[in-house]
Interface confidence: low
């Protein structure tokens, strides 16, 4: 621990000390560092702050004070393995008081309410006072006047400055001041008496369709005198006129864009193409919004939204009936449908396309399709601006050809049943097939079952009489030709137990 | 009016010291700081610190911290600018400058031209 | 330390016409909502003189076609319209953080 020596003549001159030190002990690791610290018990007990670092063969420094500090010291060595304890503190150094050097900083003028301003600073540190206050020296005068300066001294980091005209500019000067003196001579700062509510109306240029679902919006710039305030920039509100609901209690939706001062101009996108939309545009400030311009416009035709809900039936091995619902969207008069198809397995090849020129069709019969392709089926509703977004579906007529017809078939098993279940695929036409059992070991003989007939479109078969803790093939036939094999086994003991609720058994 | 007048042009052997003073009349010469800037020849404006004659406080920028000392002397209304340990890369037109009501330097002396030469 | 890069470095243009400089600064100078950038203009053998401060604001008896705009890091300096006396070398400064720094310079000339 260093050992802390205040020199007889330690103050050199009002601001600077002369510190010296015994060297510390470095335990073979050399001092790096003196670090010199210091403490205000009147202003800041117990708290450290650092004056400086020294290099560690240095055993006295001068430091640089401030005015009206109650300097007590301490000395800290610094090796590479850190900071070792500090040296017992020395007298205290009361440094004299003297004029600030500083002024707050931060200096805002501004009205909470029409007819005053606050004028506002950041409050000086208790090391920038120089003395034992500090009070502040507050000056104002209306900007440009060149007038006389009204002032007050004040102890709060604030003065309200009363009866003021309505959003007027003043320069301001906050000063430090102490028992000693003033600090320097301020920054002009500029601030305004409070605001009041716009009464500037933003007059509207025009409005420029720019497609069916964008529009852009062109007003002139405000006369700044009927803003009262500082020009903070737009509020531009719009909504679809009749998007109310009738007897709906909702409110109406209104979407709003903020448009900054020095713009006059704004895009609206997103807009519903085919609709009537009402248009506020208003001036802002710091107190509000003045009174709304208004205007309605109305955006042109677009294509289409996508029909809801399109539905393959197979009518028989090359025929399908697609089912559809109309575009939630409109976005204008529908004409029809455009309906397009191709086989999946041609890479798009031998594209098919039509239009159903009827906006009021739902349904559409399509014949003469391969009874062994999948097809991928795409429907567009129209307007006069052309095809919408396309609802798309695939699927087919074709005739069960393996097992990946059937999608995800499984079987499970019980003492004396088993349940074959699989997934029919959308479009698919219905058809019958056969479903054989066969038992599996010598002593079963390979016994079969009666093959069973099936409807794919039930999803599941349940077959019963089958022997308990038995293997058994199941096969699958359409048309007497194998199609699918699986296995199961059955549970142990004999007792007969029913299947799972909602199976459907032939 | 606010005037700054700076004194005469110096030549310098390379690690010798140069003083250069700022005499400031037409204001309260104790309420604002004074700052010193230098423009070496062909090149831009560099900052180098500054002083306030109030109390004779300093703030000096880290490249010439230990060479430069700005001082003042308040009975002439003066400020002096030393700057030791002189390179030839000093050489340069030394200003002295003080802002205005507001922000900025509003007031520039006429500059100083250093030469460090052997 | 702040670094501010101008740009261009130099710049010819003709009488009449609007000359726009730009000051990027390696981090915000903004602090108390202002602007802490200030523009000069300087000519060979003279002291800078201050033109435009905090950003923006015209300094006395510095004509109106002379304009400052920008905040955080961004800032320009307008010439609406170039009268012969304008050509010499801007410069932009910071102190919103020390040390106090100047742009390289922005020479402009005559075309």
């Known amino acids: 621990v260093p050992r802390l020596v205040l020199s007889d003549l330690h103050l050199l001159t009002q601001s600077q000390v002369r510190v010296s030190w015994s060297p510390a002990e470095d335990h073979n690791a050399p001092i790096e560092k003196y670090d010199i610290e210091f403490e205000d018990k009147e202003m800041a007990p117990e708290k450290w702050y650092s004056l400086g670092k020294v290099p560690g063969n240095q055993t006295s420094t001068t430091l640089k004070l401030s005015p009206y500090v109650h300097y007590t010291f301490r000395v800290t060595a610094i090796n590479k393995y850190g900071p070792g304890e500090p040296s017992p503190v020395s007298e205290t150094v009361v440094t004299p008081e003297a004029a600030p050097e500083k002024n707050p900083v931060d200096v805002k003028g501004e009205g909470n309410e029409t007819t005053n301003m606050v004028i506002t600073w950041k409050p000086l540190r208790w090391m920038d006072w120089n003395a034992p206050q500090v009070q502040y020296r507050v000056q104002w005068r209306p900007q440009g006047t060149r007038g006389p300066w009204q002032e007050q001294i004040v102890s709060d980091p604030f003065l309200v400055v009363s009866n003021t005209s309505t959003f007027v500019p003043y320069e301001i000067k906050v000063q430090a001041v102490n028992s000693q003196g003033k600090g320097p001579e301020p920054q002009v700062t500029i601030g305004y008496s409070g605001e009041d509510y716009p009464q500037a109306i933003p007059e509207l240029e025009g409005i420029e369709i720019l497609n069916s679902s964008a529009v852009l919006v062109k007003w002139r710039p405000v006369d700044l005198a009927q803003v009262k305030g500082h020009l903070r920039g737009y509020n531009v509100t719009y909504w679809r006129e009749g998007s109310q609901r009738k007897h709906s209690k909702r409110h109406i939706h209104k979407d709003h864009v903020v448009v900054p001062a020095n713009t006059t101009s704004v895009i609206l996108s997103g807009l519903r193409p085919y609709s009537s939309y009402h248009l506020e545009v208003q001036a802002f400030n710091g107190r509000g919004s003045g009174p709304a311009s208004e205007f309605t416009f109305s955006t042109p035709e677009g294509v289409p939204g996508h029909p809801e809900a399109l539905h393959l039936e197979c009518q028989s091995n090359t025929s399908l009936l697609l089912r559809w619902q109309p575009p939630l969207s409109h976005n204008g008069v529908l004409t029809g449908y455009v309906l397009s198809y191709h086989p999946l397995d041609e890479g798009g090849k031998g594209q098919l396309s039509f239009n159903l020129r009827d906006p009021e069709l739902r349904t559409h019969n399509l014949t003469d399709l391969s009874p062994h392709l999948r097809y991928r089926f795409q429907l567009q509703a129209t307007t006069k601006e052309g095809p919408g977004e396309a609802i798309v579906r695939e699927g087919g007529t074709m005739a069960l050809s393996g097992i990946s017809d059937f999608g995800n078939i499984s079987a499970t098993a019980g003492e004396n049943y088993s349940v074959v279940s699989w997934v029919p695929k959308e479009g698919q036409c219905n058809f019958r097939f056969h479903i054989l059992f066969k038992a599996l070991g010598e002593e079963k003989g390979g016994a079969s079952l009666s093959p069973q007939y099936v409807s794919y479109n039930q999803s599941s078969y349940t077959q019963w009489d089958l022997q308990p803790d038995t293997d058994y093939e199941i096969h699958l036939f359409k048309e007497r030709m194998f199609r699918h094999q699986m296995a199961v086994k059955t549970n142990g003991t004999g007792r007969v137990r029913l299947p799972p609720a909602g199976f459907a058994t032939e | 009016q606010v005037q700054l007048v700076q004194s005469g042009a110096e030549v310098k052997k390379p690690g010798a010291s140069v003083k250069v003073s700022c005499k400031a009349s037409?204001?309260?010469?104790?309420?604002?700081?004074m700052h010193w800037v230098r423009q070496a020849p062909g090149q831009g404006l560099e900052w180098m610190g500054n002083?306030?004659?109030?109390?004779?406080?300093?703030k000096y920028a880290q490249k010439f911290q230990g060479r430069v000392t700005m001082t003042r002397d308040t009975s002439t209304s003066t400020v002096y600018m030393e700057l030791s340990s002189l390179r030839s890369e000093d050489t340069a037109v030394y200003y002295c400058?003080?802002?205005?009501?507001?922000?900025?330097?509003?007031?520039w002396g006429q500059g100083t031209l250093v030469t460090v030469s052997s | 330390n702040i670094q501010l890069t101008q740009s261009p470095s130099s710049l010819s243009a003709s009488v009449g016409d609007r000359v726009t400089i730009t000051c990027r600064a390696s981090e915000s100078v903004d602090s108390y909502g202002s602007s802490f950038m200030h523009w000069y203009q300087q000519k060979p053998g003279k002291p800078p003189k201050l033109l435009i401060y905090?950003?923006?604001n015209l300094e006395s008896g510095v004509p109106s076609r002379f304009s400052g705009s920008g905040s955080g890091t961004d800032f320009t300096l307008t010439i609406s319209s170039l009268q012969p006396e304008d050509f010499a070398t801007y410069y932009c400064q910071q102190n919103n953080e020390d040390p106090w720094t100047f742009g390289q310079g922005t020479k402009l000339e005559i075309k």
């Open positions: 400058a003080r802002p205005g009501n507001y922000e900025g330097f509003a007031y």
């Open positions: 037409g204001y309260t010469f104790t309420s604002y700081w």
């Open positions: 905090l950003a923006s």
């Open positions: 002083v306030y004659p109030g109390s004779g406080s300093t």
